[in-house]
């Protein structure tokens, strides 16, 4: 299933992650998928 609004898939962690966390960790792999 696709990630819910405000989250993006992390290949590194194999789960959906909150885009909000990209403020603290902008280089996370999933941040590229965050608007």
């Amino acid at each position: 299933a696709p990630c819910s609004r405000g989250s993006s898939w992390s290949a590194d962690l194999a789960k959906c992650m909150d885009c909000a966390s990209c403020r603290a960790r902008p280089h996370s792999d999933f941040c590229l998928g965050c608007a």
Partner: antibody
């Protein structure tokens, strides 16, 4: 399932030292920031210290109340977190919780270990 | 440091009641997109448990009767219909900057 297990608590005299440990399992430990949070008897929660990742050069941050006395560290090869506590004071008496989080909200918590500082 | 003021410090309620807990930060903890405010539940003798992150995102496995709202400095945790297992102490926490700080807690007791 995720598990964080603290150990090392106990009774120590004022001015003494103690080293807490936290063994982690069930998540990618090396990718998660880790903190210690404490709770004095009958009181609220207080953040104590944080350690970030190898890619952050294991950056550490401390509450003013423990700066210069406590040292947080981690060993990713052992999935373990530590808190070295020196120059302990009566006001450091608390249950100490190990917490894990990717960023921001503390997703994972241990059961806590009690530290009592008393003569 | 950002101060977190929770209210009330305690409340008595009955099963089925709607319960609202508020948390006020001494400065904004929000961007235009996200709020860096989180809510935890703690039962006696147990570790805290994350309920809601980023002001309104329900953690996996948390019942839908819990909800969070707010932005800027003012935030609310609501329990739409209080259940026996909800009697506990609730804490807010910001992650806007270091040091992270928690509210003083709200103890929800049985009326």
């Amino acid at each position: 399932q995720v598990e964080l297990v603290e150990s090392g608590g106990g009774l120590v005299q004022p001015g003494g030292s103690l080293r807490l440990s936290c063994a982690a399992s069930g998540f990618t430990f090396s990718s998660y920031w880790m903190s210690w949070v404490r709770q004095a008897p009958g009181k609220g929660l207080e953040w104590v210290a944080e350690i970030r990742l190898k890619s952050d050069n294991y950056a550490t941050h401390y509450a003013e109340s423990v700066k210069g006395r406590f040292t947080i560290s981690r060993d990713d090869s052992k999935n373990s977190l530590y808190l070295q506590m020196n120059s302990l004071r009566a006001e450091d008496t608390a249950v100490y919780y190990c917490t894990g989080y990717y960023a921001d909200a503390m997703d994972y918590w241990g059961q806590g270990t009690l530290v009592t500082v008393s003569s | 440091d950002i101060q977190m003021t929770q209210s009330p410090s305690s409340l008595s309620a009955s099963v089925g009641d709607r319960v609202t807990i508020t948390c006020r930060a001494s400065q904004s903890v929000s961007t235009s997109s996200y709020s860096y405010m989180h809510w935890y539940q703690q039962k006696p003798g147990k570790a805290p448990k994350l309920l809601i992150k980023y002001a309104s995102n329900l953690e996996s496995g948390v019942p839908s009767r819990f909800s969070g709202s707010g932005s800027g400095t003012d935030f609310t945790l609501t329990i739409s219909s209080l259940q026996p297992e909800d009697f506990a102490t609730y804490y807010c926490q910001h992650s806007w900057e270091i040091p992270y700080t928690f509210g003083g807690g709200t103890k929800v007791e049985i009326k």
